[in-house]
Interface confidence: low
């Protein structure tokens, strides 16, 4: 597969992953009530996210409440907020870096420097995926630990919500996309003769040493 194709595929995966990460960050379904034996309130489900909690009745009526105070939030929610928002913003930065390093753009002149910019974009996406993975796994670990903790009352036990699964899928896309971008950039830096069209100018005159002027070669 050509470097341009790797670049395009990598960027598409990263963009989809970025969208998934934004969705996971905003959804109030990081944890959902686990119906272990019965409904604590007849036919009612509770969803909890990073920004709000929702109560869904069996009728389909949903009532959501945005968390009032940041200080009242648990450490894990505050940390998850900070890390996921950082990952989303970093992915935004990575997008511009990747576009600048893309072969189809003219932000940076073709050459090793451009390939290095593209490589940086790929690495940023990889780091972005890892950064998002931390709160997702941390949060999941807490949910699972509390689920099996006998000191947590049965009605307060939660299961992993859809947002966590979306988040994991998004991080996988970001990391795979980042790897593809890195591979595309690697091809460029490793094989410059094939990656970039080189215009040769006609030799003017031999130098005093009889060699051709080095500037005629990339």
């Amino acid at each position: 597969m050509g470097s341009a194709a790797l670049e395009i595929l990598g960027l598409v995966l990263c963009l989809v992953g970025w969208g998934g990460l934004i969705l996971a960050c905003g959804l109030p379904m990081w944890q959902v009530t686990a119906f272990l034996d019965h409904n604590i309130v007849t036919a009612q489900t509770t969803w909890k996210g990073l920004w709000m909690s929702c109560v869904v009745q069996s009728t389909g009526h949903m009532q959501c409440k945005v968390y009032d105070s940041v200080l009242a939030l648990s450490t894990e929610v505050q940390a998850a907020r900070a890390l996921t928002v950082s990952a989303v913003l970093l992915a935004f930065v990575a997008l511009f870096v990747t576009l600048a390093g893309a072969q189809c753009t003219t932000c940076v002149a073709p050459g090793p420097a451009k390939a290095r910019v593209a490589l940086t974009g790929g690495v940023l996406y990889l780091f972005c995926g890892l950064l998002a993975l931390v709160p997702l796994c941390w949060f999941a670990n807490i949910v699972v630990r509390e689920f099996y903790d006998p000191s947590v009352p049965v009605s307060q036990k939660y299961e992993l919500g859809a947002a966590l699964y979306i988040g994991w899928a998004a991080t996988a896309l970001l990391m795979v996309g980042g790897c593809l971008l890195c591979c595309g950039a690697w091809v460029c830096t490793g094989r410059p003769d094939l990656s970039f069209p080189v215009k040769y100018s006609a030799p003017r005159r031999p130098t005093a040493t009889g060699d051709y002027d080095k500037k005629n070669y990339v």
């Epitope: 119906f35 272990l36 034996d37 019965h38 409904n39 006998p150 000191s151 009352p153 009605s155 307060q156």
Partner: antibody, heavy 120, light 112 residues
Framework: EVQLVESGGGLVQPKGSLKLSCAAS????????MHWVRQAPGKGLEWVAR??????????YYVDSVKDRFIISRDDSQSMLYLQVNNLKTEDTAMYYC???????????WGQGTTLTVSS | DIVMSQSPSSLPVSVGQKVTMTCKSS????????????LAWYQQKPGQSPKLLIY???TRESGVPDRFTGSGSGTDFTLTISSVKAEDLAIYYC????????FGGGTRLEIK
């Protein structure tokens, strides 16, 4: 109307065994956790065992004094709750109640009880 | 394990009198996430099985007369009967359902 009817109690010798049964009706048995609670003559209530629903893999819990001797089980298709009591001791003599863990985690419905007497 | 202690063990009262019985737990029954106390009160009349009166420490079960009131939080709880009736003759048990299930020793309400 919710009904819990216990049966199977009787006179047993120490180290003996017995199986207590509870027939449930009037509610969706398979989604509720069920318990056995006992009451020794003239004494207070003591929680004995709990079994959760199928969605919780029928997880079981016991009070320390009956662990390894009593086995709680259920048959959702028949809406039946059971307590297999083995290696009985005289201190196991009590009225055994079948109890439903209700929507608020506490015990909202109780059976009338079945008497288990352990004596030589 | 959580240990539940009830006092008094016996409570002689007259019809129409207001009575209060207490229940103490060895550890807090308040779950901070939902601000609920995992404590229930049961009534057991002579020759009958227990009946749920109060859950979440202060919420009356449907059908329970409003003369029964539960209060308290954390480790200290009370059950108050505002005006005792002859039919209230029973043993009253508190129960924690925060971690597994433990009952108090009971308070016997006796009519003078």
């Amino acid at each position: 109307e919710v009904q819990l009817v216990e049966s199977g109690g009787g006179l047993v010798q120490p180290k003996g065994s017995l199986k207590l049964s509870c027939a449930a009706s009037g509610f969706t048995f398979n989604i509720y956790a069920m318990h056995w609670v006992r009451q020794a003559p003239g004494k207070g209530l003591e929680w004995v065992a709990r079994i959760r629903s199928k969605s919780s893999n029928y997880a079981t819990y016991y009070v320390d004094s009956v662990k390894d001797r009593f086995i709680i089980s259920r048959d959702d298709s028949q809406s039946m709750l059971y307590l297999q009591v083995n290696n009985l001791k005289t201190e196991d003599t009590a009225m055994y109640y079948c109890v439903r863990e209700g929507n608020w985690d506490c015990f909202d419905y109780w059976g009338q009880g079945t008497t288990l007497t352990v004596s030589s | 394990d959580i240990v539940m202690s009830q006092s008094p063990s016996s409570l002689p009262v007259s019809v129409g009198q207001k009575v209060t019985m207490t229940c103490k737990s060895s550890q807090s029954l308040l779950y901070t996430s939902n601000q609920k106390n995992y404590l229930a009160w049961y009534q057991q009349k002579p020759g009958q099985s227990p009946k749920l009166l109060i859950y979440w420490a202060s919420t009356r079960e449907s059908g329970v007369p409003d003369r029964f009131t539960g209060s308290g939080s954390g480790t200290d709880f009370t059950l108050t009967i505002s005006s005792v009736k002859a039919e209230d003759l029973a043993i009253y048990y508190c129960q924690q359902y925060y971690r597994y299930h433990t009952f108090g020793g009971g308070t016997r309400l006796e009519i003078k």
